[in-house]
Amino acid sequence: FNISGCSTKKLLWTYSTRSEEEFVLFCDLPEPQKSHFCHRNRLSPKQVPEHLPFMGSNDLSDVQWYQQPSNGDPLEDIRKSYPHIIQDKCTLHFLTPGVNNSGSYICRPKMIKSPYDVACCVKMILEVKPQTNASCEYSASHKQDLLLGSTGSISCPSLSCQSDAQSPAVTWYKNGKLLSVERSNRIVVDEVYDYHQGTYVCDYTQSDTVSSWTVRAVVQVRTIVGDTKLKPDILDPVEDTLEVELGKPLTISCKARFGFERVFNPVIKWYIKDSDLEWEVSVPEAKSIKSTLKDEIIERNIILEKVTQRDLRRKFVCFVQNSIGNTTQSVQLKEKRG
C-alpha cells in the first residue's frame, strides 16, 4: 500500500547501556475522539485529527505493523521478521534496546472498511541512541519501586535531573492509557496502592529550528512492601528427628519463608555434621514454591540414594539466611522399628 499519505511522528529512544529496558510504540491512528479498535482514549475531544477519522472495527488485534527497510525494499511484516518485537493489541513492544531498532514503523488497520481508510496509517520514525555519559549522574531508573502505603513518585528517566521549573510538559501513559492530568517530569503519588504498579510511558517534545520530535521512555513500576526486619524462618522440617528405613531412598525437604527485601539474596543450603566434621552437601537447586508481595517460600531438598547406618549417626542441617540473619534446623535420622 502507499504510505505517502500516512501521518508521521518522529520518536527518540535514548537507552542506558547499564540496564535492561523496554520501549513501546502506540498505533496513534488519527481519530477525533477514540480509537475504535484500540479502546484507548488518546486524543482530547478538542484535538483535531490530521486525517479523516478511521471507521475502524472493535477488534483489538485489528491493526497491522510493518517496518520499512532503509534500502527501499517492500514493507516487512513485523511479526514475521523481528522476534524481539512483540505486538500487543495496538502497541509494539521492543524487548531489547539497540541502535538496530532505529527505522520507520508503520501501523494501519487490517480491515479497510471505507475509502477513507486507505490513508489511515501512521508512520513512526524511530531513532535509537545509547545514552551519553554527559547525561546527569543520578538519572532515574527504568525500573522503579513504590513502597505500599507511603508517598512516592515515578520519575521520567530522560528528565529526572530537571527541576520542576525547567521541566517541559510531559505526556504520561499507564498500561497504554493516557493520564491526561499528569503533565510533569514526575508523577507524585500521595499514597501508594498496588494498582500503581504497571508500565508507564513518558513523552516530551524536543525541537530545534528545523523539526520537533518526541522523546520517549518506558518505566516499569513495581509496588513493594518495606524490607523485612526478620530473619527467615524454617517451615519444614519441624521435628528434629525423622524415622527412616535403612537401605531405602530418602528425600528431606527444607522449606523456608523469606520476608520481602528489595535486594534479595536468599541462602538455603544443607550441610551434614558428623562428630567434629561438617560439610555442605551438593543438592538440587532451590526452587521458589510460593511468592507473595510480602514474602517468598523457597524449598531445597537433600536426596539420599539409600539410607545407611552411618547416616543415623549424622545430623542433617538446613541453613537459611537473608540480610538480617540466619536460622538452622537440624534433623537426626532414626531407624523405624518393627
Partner: antibody, heavy 113, light 111 residues
Framework: SVEESGGRLVTPGTPLTLTCTVS????????MSWVRQAPGKGLEYIGI?????STYYANWAKGRFTIAKTSTTVDLKITSPTTEDTATYFC???????????WGPGTLVTVSL | AAVLTQTPSPVSAAVGGTVSISCQSS????????LSWFQQKPGQPPKLLIY???TLASGVPSRFKGSGSGTQFTLTISDVQCDDAATYYC???????????FGGGTEVVVK
C-alpha cells in the same frame, strides 16, 4: 518571558482575541493557562492548552472562550463578550494543569456599551 | 464543579509574628496534593509560592510553608515581614481539568 496583548475597550457581543507571546521557551514543550481577574475581585481559571494543542476549559468558561496557539503565541478568543468579562487577562506557563512560575503582566479588557 | 473556600479577609499579622491561611477544597484535589498557593500585590500578576501542597517554589523564602492533604490545606507565614502584605490565593487541580479553580483570596494586612 510571557506578555499578553490585545486588551481594549469593546462593545458587548464583539468577539475579541487576546494574544500571549512567549520567548525563552518553546510552546511545543510547555502547557499554558489563561486566568482572569475582574477589577477588585479574585482570580478565575479559564483554561489550558497543552503542548500537543489539546485544550481544556473551566466549566463556566466552556463555549465562551477558545484557546489556540501558534509556534510562539497563545490566543484567547472571547467569543461574545458581556460586561461581566471586563477583567485583566493573564497567561501563565503551567505545570501539571495549574498555572506555575512564569506569568505575564496581564492585559485589560473592558466591555462596555 | 469544585469549590475552594479560603479564610475570610482580611487577616491581620504583626511583624515578626506568624499567620495562617486555610483553604478548603470540595471535592479532594487530584492525588490529594495538587494545590498551589500564590501571592498577589496590587497591579502585579500572581507569584507562585507553593505547589504540590507543600513544595516551596524556587526563590521563595522558607518562611512560607504549605501543608495539608486532600481537602484541607494551610499556608503558614512565619516571621512576617511588611513585604508580605498582599492577597493570597490557593488554586486546586482536579481529576477533571475543567474543575480546576482558584480560592476567593485572603488579604493579609501587616501591622
Amino acid at each position: 518571558s510571557v506578555e499578553e496583548s490585545g486588551g481594549r475597550l469593546v462593545t458587548p457581543g464583539t468577539p475579541l482575541t487576546l494574544t500571549c507571546t512567549v520567548s525563552g521557551f518553546s510552546l511545543n514543550s510547555y502547557d499554558m493557562s489563561w486566568v482572569r481577574q475582574a477589577p477588585g475581585k479574585g482570580l478565575e481559571y479559564i483554561g489550558i492548552i497543552y503542548d500537543s494543542g489539546s485544550t481544556y476549559y473551566a466549566n463556566w468558561a466552556k463555549g465562551r472562550f477558545t484557546i489556540a496557539k501558534t509556534s510562539t503565541t497563545v490566543d484567547l478568543k472571547i467569543t461574545s463578550p458581556t460586561t461581566e468579562d471586563t477583567a485583566t487577562y493573564f497567561c501563565a506557563r503551567t505545570l501539571n494543569t495549574l498555572p506555575f512560575n512564569i506569568w505575564g503582566p496581564g492585559t485589560l479588557v473592558t466591555v462596555s456599551l | 464543579a469544585a469549590v475552594l473556600t479560603q479564610t475570610p479577609s482580611p487577616v491581620s499579622a504583626a511583624v515578626g509574628g506568624t499567620v495562617s491561611i486555610s483553604c478548603q477544597s470540595s471535592p479532594s484535589v487530584y492525588n490529594n496534593n495538587r494545590l498551589s498557593w500564590f501571592q498577589q500585590k496590587p497591579g502585579q500578576p500572581p507569584k507562585l509560592l507553593i505547589y504540590y501542597a507543600s513544595t516551596l517554589a524556587s526563590g521563595v523564602p522558607s518562611r512560607f510553608k504549605g501543608s495539608g492533604s486532600g481537602t484541607q490545606f494551610t499556608l503558614t507565614i512565619s516571621d512576617v515581614q511588611c513585604d508580605d502584605a498582599a492577597t493570597y490565593y490557593c488554586a486546586g487541580g482536579y481529576s477533571t481539568i475543567s474543575d480546576n479553580a482558584f480560592g476567593g483570596g485572603t488579604e493579609v494586612v501587616v501591622k
